[in-house]
Interface confidence: medium
């Protein structure tokens, strides 16, 4: 279970039509579901509900996003339709380069991710919680444009890196 | 004002290999991409790989993974590319690419580039 | 991979034309396209980013449109120095691609 260093940058229109950005660091997880890959991508944030929308068609997004899934607590979705690792399989069949769980509601969710699939993922399969998780979700939820990319090493300097 | 350097032009046999390296002077690029794109002769411009130096991992393109491999030394604010298993077709002008602050995506800032010749 | 297309490849214009330049991805990448100039036996130069957004000290002249698959380049008004290839390349995901450039000549 290796640390992904992942970094957000944030896009903020202006008035004038320019934009500021802004650029966050936290850490991750990667989980044996997946590999343990770099990978960037525009953030496409995603309900575990969508998720289990079979049509395929209707809910095909271009290759090369990230995916952001906000678990909820396994209480709220008694009988979920997909287990976590299936959530992961149909956002990548969607065309994502990379998944990121939140797991802060549903610790459970990290256990399952790491049973080791005897088919694992090609693309990479984080998750995230506590501060890092609040932090990432922050940004997602603002609405903006936001873009992910995940890294298999830590930064050789992390103030530079985290001192945002 | 960051500017790249490149290494000298080269020539090479093919099967051998090349080590280009491409110094950032005026400054440091330990937090900013630097990339590496080559041009073939009277062709377009095809994106090889990049590194980030304070993380150290590389992102290649598929057609060279394997035989590209990108480094940084950030004590020297120098980053090489070496190409193995060099072909004719790998004549190409190499440039070192970077942005002038930050991971990029786009290349605002282009080192002058470095021939390299493969013949036998 | 993501293919980048652009047409034409080649143009011949006379100083004060207005050129077009079209570029179209092979799926959809939002915004995240720029456009380079290059003249020969010199490296590319940014000219656009974000398909619209021009880089700091590029003239006026020059202007960026389009979203999802198809962008465009346009010189409102070819001046000498304009003579040069002109790239287009996709920033949405890994790797990075290029087109294969238009050569805009000299009538």
């Known amino acids: 279970k290796e640390t992904a260093f992942v970094e957000v940058v944030l896009f903020e229109s202006s008035p004038s039509g320019d934009y500021t950005t802004y650029t966050t660091g936290l850490t991750g997880r990667f989980s044996r579901a997946g590999a343990t890959l770099s990978a960037e991508g525009e953030i496409v944030q995603m309900h575990p509900l969508g998720l289990c929308n079979n049509n395929d068609e209707e809910d095909l997004y271009e290759y090369g996003w990230v995916g952001v899934v906000k678990l909820e607590q396994p209480e709220l979705d008694p009988k979920p339709c997909l287990t976590v690792l299936g959530k992961a399989k149909r956002a990548v069949q969607r065309g994502a380069t990379a998944v990121i769980f939140d797991v802060s509601e549903n610790p459970e969710a990290i256990d399952q991710l790491n049973q080791g699939s005897e088919d694992p993922l090609k693309r990479p399969v984080v998750y995230v919680k506590g501060a890092d998780a609040i932090k990432l979700m922050n940004i997602v939820n603002k609405q903006k444009v936001a873009r992910a990319r995940i890294q298999h090493r830590p930064p050789r300097q992390p103030t530079e890196y985290f001192d945002m | 004002q960051v500017q790249l350097v490149q290494s000298g032009a080269e020539v090479k046999k093919p099967g051998s290999s090349v080590k280009v390296s491409c110094k950032a002077s005026?400054?440091?690029?330990?937090?900013?991409?630097i990339n590496w794109v080559r041009q073939a002769p009277g062709q377009g411009l095809e994106w090889m790989g990049g590194i980030i130096p304070i993380f150290g991992t590389a992102n290649y393109a598929q057609k060279f993974q394997g035989r590209v491999t990108i480094t940084a030394d950030e004590s020297t604010s120098t980053a090489y590319m070496e190409l193995s298993s060099l072909r004719s077709e790998d004549t190409a002008v190499y440039y070192c690419?970077?942005?002038?602050?930050?991971?990029?995506?786009?290349?605002?800032?282009w080192g002058r580039g470095t021939l390299v010749t493969v013949s036998s | 991979d993501i293919q980048m297309t652009q047409s034409p490849s080649s143009l011949s214009a006379s100083v004060g034309d207005r050129v077009t330049i079209t570029c179209r991805a092979s799926?959809?990448?939002?915004?995240?396209l720029a456009w380079y100039q290059q003249k020969p036996g010199k490296a590319p130069k940014l000219l656009i980013y974000d398909a619209s957004s021009l880089e700091t000290g590029v003239p006026s002249r020059f202007s960026g449109s389009g979203s999802g698959t198809d962008f465009t380049l346009t010189i409102s008004s070819l001046q000498p120095e304009d003579f040069a290839t002109y790239y287009c390349q996709q920033a949405y995901s890994f790797p990075w691609t290029f087109g294969q450039g238009t050569k805009v000549e000299i009538k």
């Open positions: 799926q959809s990448i939002s915004r995240w």
């Open positions: 005026g400054g440091t690029f330990s937090n900013t991409d």
């Open positions: 690419v970077g942005g002038r602050s930050g991971w990029i995506w786009y290349f605002d800032l």
